[in-house]
């Protein structure tokens, strides 16, 4: 049994780090492998993660952690029974992928404006809470040529779009993702998308 692509891990800077790797051949990850992890810290214990399959030769493991601080460093050992396949380390603060924003809602009852709101995925006491900026993707299923990214660089998780910039009488979808500038993170996954119908019509005198 051999590791083809070494484990690569990202942290949500809250309670979970996700490690993914590829094996040399088809593997039943949960039955054959264990990823052991231990915080380099006085009297810390070794914890075990049972991986799941992620495609034929891919494995993924979700490491449960306490809150993350910048000093944290983990040792990682990938075992197949009594055989050590790989040994490495992981510093969560240097490999952060934020959680995806949630509760994306579209408010169309605001005059002349489409208002999108969503929730910050972190509690106020988390370091990332005040560091997230967002990208909102809006596209139309009726008009495949239409797709826009709106960068939200302020803290408030809202975006206002003049309804007049969207075509009337067709449906749109929106989704949002986040990143944290000062932590040099990757982008989060996209939130689930939300659909709405743009019924806005310009006043008669403006037509």
């Amino acid at each position: 049994m051999k590791v083809l692509q070494e484990p690569a891990c990202v942290s949500d800077y809250m309670s979970i780090s996700t490690c993914e790797w590829k094996m040399g051949g088809p593997t039943n990850c949960s039955a054959e492998l264990r990823l052991l992890y231990q915080l380099v810290f006085q009297s810390s214990e070794t914890h075990t993660c049972v991986p799941e399959n992620n495609g034929g030769v891919g494995c993924v493991c979700h490491l449960l952690m306490d809150d993350v601080v910048s000093m944290d460093n983990y040792t990682l050992d990938l075992w197949a029974g009594q055989q050590l396949l790989w040994k490495g380390s992981f510093k969560p603060s240097e490999h952060v992928k934020p959680r995806a924003p949630g509760n994306l809602t579209v408010h169309t009852n605001v005059s002349d404006t489409v208002l999108l709101t969503w929730s910050n995925p972190y509690p106020p006491d988390n370091y990332l809470y005040n560091d997230l900026t967002y990208a909102v993707n809006i596209w139309s299923e009726n008009d495949p040529a239409y797709s826009r990214i709106h960068n939200v660089t302020y803290l408030k998780p809202t975006l206002r779009i003049p309804a007049s910039t969207l075509k009337s009488g067709i449906s749109y979808r929106a989704r949002v993702r986040a990143w944290a500038q000062h932590y040099n993170t990757t982008w989060s996954e996209w939130s689930p998308s939300t659909k709405w119908y743009n019924s806005y019509r310009e006043p008669f005198e403006q037509r």
Epitope: L39, F41, Q42, S43, S44, E45, T46, H47, L64, M65, D66, D67, V69, S70, M71, D72
Partner: antibody, heavy 125, light 112 residues
Framework: EVQLVESGGGLEQPGGSLRLSCAGS????????MTWVRQAPGKGLEWVSS????????YYADSVKGRFTISRDNSKNTLYLQMNSLRAEDTAVYYC??????????????????WGQGTTVTVSS | DIVMTQSPLSLPVTPGEPASISCRSS???????????VDWYLQKSGQSPQLLIY???KRASGVPDRFSGSGSGTDFTLKISRVEAEDVGFYYC?????????FGQGTKLEIK
């Protein structure tokens, strides 16, 4: 009531051996790391050794490394310190203390919040 | 190893007056925001040490509120707002960031 009771101290000749015990009660023993601290006559406190809750991880002061062995039996709620190749400078009161909660990924630290009454070790010919 | 240096080593105090003991570490004991791995212990004559303050500023259970801990990084202070006769003994700071744990030399607090 949370309590630690040491035993096993006594008079021993240089080069000899002693085994100290520390019985814990009133708390979930296996969840806590444990520590030994000693105090030579008229001197300050000196850390000797620590062990994680499971017993998998042990730590020693340079002055005792290779001579002392810390261990625990969680089924008996008991901590041990096996002392071999004793020297005159090992003469001290030995205290066991409850250390950090080590069941969480990052052990939770509340200080050495419970101490035993101490057991006296005298090494002399 | 981290060296812990206490001062003063002897502290005569009048009952009812405040007292302050300083402890300096040879390297930072700050692990994360608000968490400095330094403790303060009191050892009364003929007794085992007892925990007063942990993580720099957290008062242990049952410890009177006249005891307080402060400081961050490498400089720490134990303050007693009004010394009482029962407070006499040796006070030790200890770093618990990692092994080897190291103690200060001890400060002897006595009543004038």
């Amino acid at each position: 009531e949370v309590q630690l009771v040491e035993s096993g101290g006594g008079l021993e000749q240089p080069g000899g051996s002693l085994r100290l015990s520390c019985a814990g009660s009133g708390f979930t023993f296996r969840d806590s790391a444990m520590t030994w601290v000693r105090q030579a006559p008229g001197k300050g406190l000196e850390w000797v050794s620590s062990i994680s809750g499971s017993g998998d991880n042990t730590y020693y002061a340079d002055s005792v490394k290779g001579r002392f062995t810390i261990s625990r039996d969680n089924s008996k709620n008991t901590l041990y310190l096996q002392m071999n190749s004793l020297r005159a400078e090992d003469t001290a009161v030995y205290y066991c203390a409850k250390d950090r909660l080590s069941i969480t990924v990052r052990p939770r630290y509340y200080g050495l919040d419970v101490w035993g009454q101490g057991t006296t070790v005298t090494v002399s010919s | 190893d981290i060296v812990m240096t206490q001062s003063p080593l002897s502290l005569p105090v009048t009952p009812g007056e405040p007292a302050s003991i300083s402890c300096r570490s040879s390297q930072s004991l700050l692990y994360s925001i608000g968490k400095n791995y330094v403790d303060w212990y009191l050892q009364k004559s003929g007794q085992s040490p007892q925990l007063l303050i942990y993580l720099g500023n957290k008062r242990a259970s049952g410890v009177p509120d006249r005891f307080s801990g402060s400081g961050s990084g490498t400089d720490f202070t134990l303050k007693i707002s009004r010394v009482e006769a029962e407070d006499v003994g040796f006070y030790y700071c200890m770093q618990a960031l990692g092994s080897p744990y190291t103690f200060g030399q001890g400060t002897k607090l006595e009543i004038k």
